[in-house]
């Protein structure tokens, strides 16, 4: 049985050229995290961090993607087509799938503040 | 050398689920550094990867497939296994499995293929 | 997703020639392509990767070469036994894509 919750950083906005932090934190549940996948809005692959064999940071976003802190993903560089949905999903045992979704807005604006409080989605 | 089998049912019949099976031999699934892909090709046409799994359960899925697209791995038996449901005829192909370089996805030693095909 | 485009699709050669195939990508994918080769009822297999890469236990005839978008496989001197498909892959992102593949056959 599933028991835990994915909490995210939610609807969060961050200024053009400036950096992100995109975080999800599952709790609730004693499984083991095997690997996190974090796609973006069209579902390709950002990065994976597989508890095994680390961080891998997929080759078209590797000057403007960072792995962490912790099991989370750092944007960078943003640009106005950052603008979307980003998901972690967790892949754990015995429990199975988790999956947790962020809404990333950026904005021209140099007043824009970056919003990171964490939601439950 | 490592070695991949892929074994399964020939036919399958339109809105029911194809399973297949990787075995692999002359090393281990859990060996690593490795994920474990499947790819197909359709008659005439190129191939299309279909999705990974490593050998703790970790997957990712083609995101044009990955509705209908399941896999597993049995470490005990030093398989991995494909499952795609509600398949049509769009689904006929030469079904590869493959093993892959974690990260960049090189697939750097593939089974023979074997061919489904989806129809009533 | 990225778009892999080869060509020819189809080739007629003799052995001992030299046979170029090219593969064009939609966008730029730095060096992240993988070569291989297939034959009927065989499993396929990796030639080269990261575009110039020589897998071990390929015979250096074959050779690739390329960046950005635009890349090319080479056999220097046509053997019997590369009498195949051939096609490529790019790894930079996810999914990864195939081209439509090239025949090689006997002229």
């Known amino acids: 049985m599933m028991t835990g919750t994915i909490e995210t950083t939610g609807n969060i906005s961050a200024k053009k050229g400036g950096s992100v932090i995109l975080q999800c934190h599952l709790s609730s549940t004693m499984a083991q995290v095997t690997q996190v996948n974090w796609e973006q809005h069209d579902h390709s692959l950002l990065a994976i961090r597989n508890a095994e064999l680390g961080w891998h940071i997929y080759p078209a976003f590797k000057d403007r993607v960072a792995p962490g802190p912790g099991l989370g993903l750092t944007l960078q560089s943003l640009t106005m087509n950052d603008t979307g949905e980003y998901f972690c999903t967790y892949h754990t045992y015995p429990d199975g799938t988790y999956r947790g979704r962020i809404f990333l807005e950026v904005l021209e604006s140099s007043v824009a503040e970056h919003s990171a409080r964490f939601q439950i989605p | 050398q490592v070695q991949l089998q892929e074994s399964g049912p020939g036919l399958v019949k339109p809105s029911q689920t194809l399973s297949l099976t990787c075995t692999v031999s002359g090393g281990s699934i859990s060996s690593g550094g490795y994920y474990w892909s499947w790819i197909r090709q359709h008659p005439g046409k190129g191939l299309e990867w279909i999705g990974y799994i490593y050998y703790r359960g970790g997957t990712y899925y083609n995101p044009s497939l990955r509705s209908r697209v399941t896999m597993s791995v049995d470490t005990s038996k030093n398989q991995f296994s494909l499952m795609l449901s509600s398949v049509t005829a769009a689904d006929t192909a030469v079904y590869y499995c493959?093993?892959?370089?974690?990260?960049?996805?090189?697939?750097?030693?593939w089974g023979q293929g074997t061919p489904v095909t989806v129809s009533s | 997703d990225i778009q892999m485009t080869q060509s020819p699709s189809s080739l007629s050669a003799s052995v001992g020639d030299r046979v170029t195939i090219t593969c064009r990508s939609s966008q730029s994918i730095s060096s992240y392509l993988n070569w291989y080769q297939q034959k009927p009822g065989r499993a396929p297999k990796l030639l080269i990767h990261a575009a110039s890469s020589l897998q071990s236990g390929v015979p250096s005839r074959f050779s690739g070469s390329g960046s950005g978008t635009d890349f090319t496989l080479t056999i220097s001197s046509l053997q019997p036994e590369d009498f195949a498909s051939y096609c490529c892959q790019q790894s930079y992102t996810t999914p990864p894509t195939f081209g439509g593949g090239t025949k090689v056959e006997i002229k």
């Open positions: 493959a093993r892959t370089i974690f990260g960049v996805i090189i697939l750097d030693n």
